[in-house]
């Protein structure tokens, strides 16, 4: 006999990285017929929603109108059908950005390189932080973490066309409080390759949609938000 229901999906819209004072919605998708959803923050009950009518709703939204460092942290949700509770969702790491300062991102040997060339990004921030994060724009969240007193090195190693795209970096004051994003750096990888199988390019968003992460299909939603959850967990723990 089943003692718990399947865990719900949790994600943030438009993104898990939220500029301070901006709004964010935490979404929790369980099952039709769920009579109650609970949102937990840092292990404690944060909010409750009881959808009406439950048999026609399988998703609830928890709205945060004004993001700040107190609201940043780890969220999870659970739902109940009758007396039976679900497993808790994966943890969602909600990050507040645009704190304090703006780092500088550079890439060596340059923003245009040849396939196979070794590339290193440098993220520099003169204020007190020792953790830096490099992110590539696009559906799949390519995130690297680096450390240094005022600058972190992010070696990409020999690059392929899959590394093409727009990169930004952040300084991190703690796991859930990040600086303003750096100016974007677009990496262009050129090169005619013979007898080499390369990874396909990642779909990337135009620079002006940075920070918006909108998906249309429920399947895509579930898959990609699970990916975001997974990325956030790996990144922030």
């Amino acid at each position: 006999q089943q003692q718990t229901l399947p865990k719900p999906f949790i994600w943030a819209e438009p993104h898990f990285m939220v500029p301070k004072e901006k709004q964010v919605t935490i979404c929790c998708q369980g099952n039709y017929g769920a009579v109650e959803y609970q949102l937990h923050f840092e292990g404690s009950l944060f909010a409750v929603d009881r959808p009406k009518p439950p048999e026609r709703i399988n998703k609830v939204k928890f709205y945060i109108p004004d993001m700040n460092s107190r609201m940043a942290g780890q969220y999870s949700c659970i739902y109940r059908v009758g007396e039976l509770w679900s497993e808790p969702s994966n943890l969602l790491d909600l990050v507040v950005t645009e704190m304090y300062d703006t780092p500088t991102l550079s890439v060596h040997p340059g923003p245009e390189v040849i396939s196979g060339e070794k590339v290193t990004f440098y993220c520099r921030l003169d204020t007190a932080t020792s953790m830096f994060l490099l992110l590539k724009e696009g559906r799949s969240s390519h995130v690297q973490r680096g450390y240094g007193k005022v600058q972190a090195e992010f070696p990409l190693g020999p690059v392929t066309t899959a590394h093409r795209g727009t990169y930004r970096c952040f300084g991190s004051y703690n796991n859930h409080a990040w600086s303003f994003p750096s100016e974007p750096v677009k990496l262009l990888v050129t090169g005619d390759i013979e007898n080499t199988s390369l990874a396909p390019e990642d779909p990337t968003f135009p620079a002006d949609t940075w920070g918006t992460y909108l998906l249309t299909t429920e399947t895509g939603l579930q898959k990609d938000h699970a990916l975001w959850d997974h990325t956030a967990q790996n990144l922030l723990r």
Epitope: S115, G116, P158
Partner: antibody, heavy 116, light 107 residues
Framework: QVQLVQSGAEVKKPGSSVKVSCKAS????????MHWVRQAPGQGLEWIGG????????SYNQKFKGRATITADKSTSTAYMELSSLRSEDTAVYYC?????????WGQGTTVTVSS | EIVMTQSPATLSVSPGERATLSCRAS??????LHWYQQKPGQAPRLLIK???QSISGIPARFSGSGSGTDFTLTISSLEPEDFAVYYC?????????FGQGTKLEIK
């Protein structure tokens, strides 16, 4: 110490080809791209193209695409630049240069003279 | 392609004096600008990378500055061996391009 040693001077007829070599030592050959730059007599520097020896990725100046072929042999740590359909304007000193961000090390240069 | 323009074409300065060489890019190249020195019959030699970063083994009298489109190479006090041709190079975008050179001659 890093050294790039190029092959000797060449005299070629118009319409023919020349292949210049550049043997690298003192560093891991596959970790840096190798580029070719030429300098006509009394003129400035002109980039021809470059290669990433580890997977053979190349990039060319459009001006030379189709005429220049850059290759690399990892087993001998040697890069090559072949230029075909030579004309008198190709008379120049040809340099190989390692790209460590900038061109941090250069070969001694190979003089190619194209004359009928 | 990014066009690099150096000025002046020739600069006449006395030993011991300061020399200032300019390089302008046709579009912004951030700090992806490198400086080289070339003497007759020799290969170019790297002096400054990324606009202002010094190179091991290069005398401290050589310094670079600038960002975006305008760059400067300064030689604080000229030595006899500094009289040569100087080139700037765009390291930002392919094709990699060089300025036409500034010839530094003894006044």
């Amino acid at each position: 110490q890093v050294q790039l040693v190029q092959s000797g001077a060449e005299v070629k007829k118009p319409g023919s080809s020349v292949k210049v070599s550049c043997k690298a030592s003192g560093y891991t050959f596959s970790e840096y791209t190798m580029h070719w730059v030429r300098q006509a007599p009394g003129q400035g520097l002109e980039w021809i193209g470059g290669i990433s020896p580890n997977i053979g990725g190349t990039s060319y100046n459009q001006k030379f695409k189709g005429r220049a072929t850059i290759t690399a042999d990892k087993s001998t740590s040697t890069a090559y630049m072949e230029l075909s359909s030579l004309r008198s304007e190709d008379t120049a000193v040809y340099y190989c240069a390692r790209r460590g961000g900038s061109f941090d090390y250069w070969g001694q240069g190979t003089t190619v003279t194209v004359s009928s | 392609e990014i066009v690099m323009t150096q000025s002046p074409a020739t600069l006449s300065v006395s030993p011991g004096e300061r020399a200032t060489l300019s390089c302008r890019a046709s579009q912004s190249i951030s700090d992806y600008l490198h400086w080289y020195q070339q003497k007759p019959g020799q290969a170019p030699r790297l002096l400054i990378k990324y606009a202002s970063q010094s190179i091991s083994g290069i005398p401290a009298r050589f310094s670079g500055s600038g960002s975006g489109t305008d760059f400067t190479l300064t030689i604080s006090s000229l030595e006899p061996e500094d009289f040569a041709v100087y080139y700037c190079q765009n390291g930002h975008s392919f094709p990699l391009t060089f300025g036409q050179g500034t010839k530094l001659e003894i006044k």
